[in-house]
């Protein structure tokens, strides 16, 4: 479900002769006027809509937080795309902030995955090869992590 699907400014288009099942909707990059007759453009760099809609207002563009870089700006049809700065990542269960990546693995573990903007370094036990999920108590070695490239829209 997108942010737009949950938007509160839904309206019922006024009853009138309909030319198609979707009359009363406006294209991406627009919202509908209060009387339901016109489509009004979102304001470039300020707000957006991503789907055909009957929103009374476009959705406000996200501003990237400090600790994030802007991968692509907000357009009238797409929200800003923000990414954690190098050396930090955003977890699925705590998407509101970027957290620092660990610099190395605990004793008895080896690094098998680098720090990326969406994941911490990945460590596995030397012998068993099983992943380690807890916090690192003591660090055996310091490994500089390298950032990844894929982007994800800010939430």
């Amino acid at each position: 479900i997108t942010q737009q699907d949950l938007a509160p400014q839904q309206r019922v288009a006024p009853q009138q002769k309909r030319s198609s099942p979707s009359e009363g909707l406006c294209p991406p990059g627009h919202h509908i006027s209060e009387d339901g007759r016109d489509c009004i453009s979102c304001k470039y760099g300020q707000d957006y809509s991503t789907h055909w809609n009957d929103l009374l207002f476009c959705l406000r563009c996200t501003r990237c937080d400090s600790g994030e870089v802007e991968l692509s700006p907000c357009t009238t049809t797409r929200n800003t795309v923000c990414q954690c700065e190098e050396g930090t990542f955003r977890e699925e269960d705590s998407p509101e902030m970027c957290r620092k990546c660990r610099t190395g693995c605990p004793r008895g573990m080896v690094k098998v995955g680098d720090c990326t903007p969406w994941s911490d370094i990945e460590c596995v036990h030397k012998e068993s090869g099983t992943k380690h999920s807890g916090e690192a108590p003591a660090v055996e070695e310091t490994v500089t992590s390298s950032p990844g490239t894929p982007a994800s829209p800010c939430s």
């Epitope: 198609s20 979707s22 909707l25 294209p27 991406p28 990059g29 009004i40 055909w52 049809t77």
Partner: antibody, heavy 119, light 107 residues
Framework: QVQLVQSGAEVKKPGASVKVSCKAS????????LHWVRQAPGQGLEWMGW????????KYNEKFKDRVTITADKSTSTVYMELSSLRSEDTAVYYC????????????WGQGTLVTVSS | DIQMTQSPSFLSASVGDRVTITCRAS??????VAWYQQKPGKAPKLLIY???TRHTGVPDRFSGSGSGTDFTLTISSLQPEDIATYYC?????????FGGGTKLEIK
């Protein structure tokens, strides 16, 4: 490359109807909105309405709403504009044009179809 | 409906001149304005959208500016092939409307 090819010139009598076609090629038909814009001789441009093949959305300029009908045949990637109850002031070149699902400017245009209304 | 008033209606200039065409909207249209070039017997061609963004393949001698109600199309150095009629269009609110056009000719 993107092409919008329109049907040929028409001469009609007042009160009659005309149906102009616009065949699209060179892009995915269901991803762009197609519009009709007209231009009377020596005059400016006037937006008439749109059709979006992706969800069959149609929107008309209120000025033409009672007389214009826009339809499409997705199997041939063709959009049609029918204008009824023709009068002499409907004499114009009728263009189809497309725009992305976003800002309402037109990046490609058909070659135009001259419709002459004369008794 | 929003009225788009273009000026001048006719403009005569020499090759190499800097040419400016203005367009005034009857109400605020933010930056939702496009400019088109139309040569006789041909369909319009998109030059500028969002008031100042040049369309793909448009020479950089064409530039646009403005926001709110006042907009400008500038040709920095007029070329013979620029002889045409130019139209502004607001794409802020339906029905989308066009200016009356500016016919540009060589002195």
């Amino acid at each position: 490359q993107v092409q919008l090819v329109q049907s040929g010139a028409e001469v009609k009598k007042p009160g009659a109807s005309v149906k102009v076609s616009c065949k699209a090629s060179g892009y995915t038909f269901t991803e762009y909105i197609l519009h009709w814009v007209r231009q009377a001789p020596g005059q400016g441009l006037e937006w008439m309405g749109w059709f979006y093949p992706g969800n069959n959305n149609i929107k008309y300029n209120e000025k033409f709403k009672d007389r214009v009908t826009i339809t499409a045949d997705k199997s041939t990637s063709t959009v049609y504009m029918e204008l009824s109850s023709l009068r002499s002031e409907d004499t114009a070149v009728y263009y189809c044009a497309r725009h992305e699902q976003g800002p309402g400017y037109f990046d490609y245009w058909g070659q135009g179809t001259l419709v002459t209304v004369s008794s | 409906d929003i009225q788009m008033t273009q000026s001048p209606s006719f403009l005569s200039a020499s090759v190499g001149d800097r040419v400016t065409i203005t367009c005034r909207a009857s109400q605020d249209v933010n930056t939702a304005v496009a400019w088109y070039q139309q040569k006789p017997g041909k369909a319009p061609k998109l030059l500028i959208y969002w008031a100042s963004t040049r369309h793909t393949g448009v020479p950089d001698r064409f530039s646009g500016s403005g926001s709110g109600t006042d907009f400008t199309l500038t040709i920095s150095s007029l070329q013979p092939e620029d002889i045409a009629t130019y139209y502004c269009q607001q794409h802020y609110i339906t029905p989308w409307t066009f200016g009356g056009g500016t016919k540009l000719e060589i002195k």
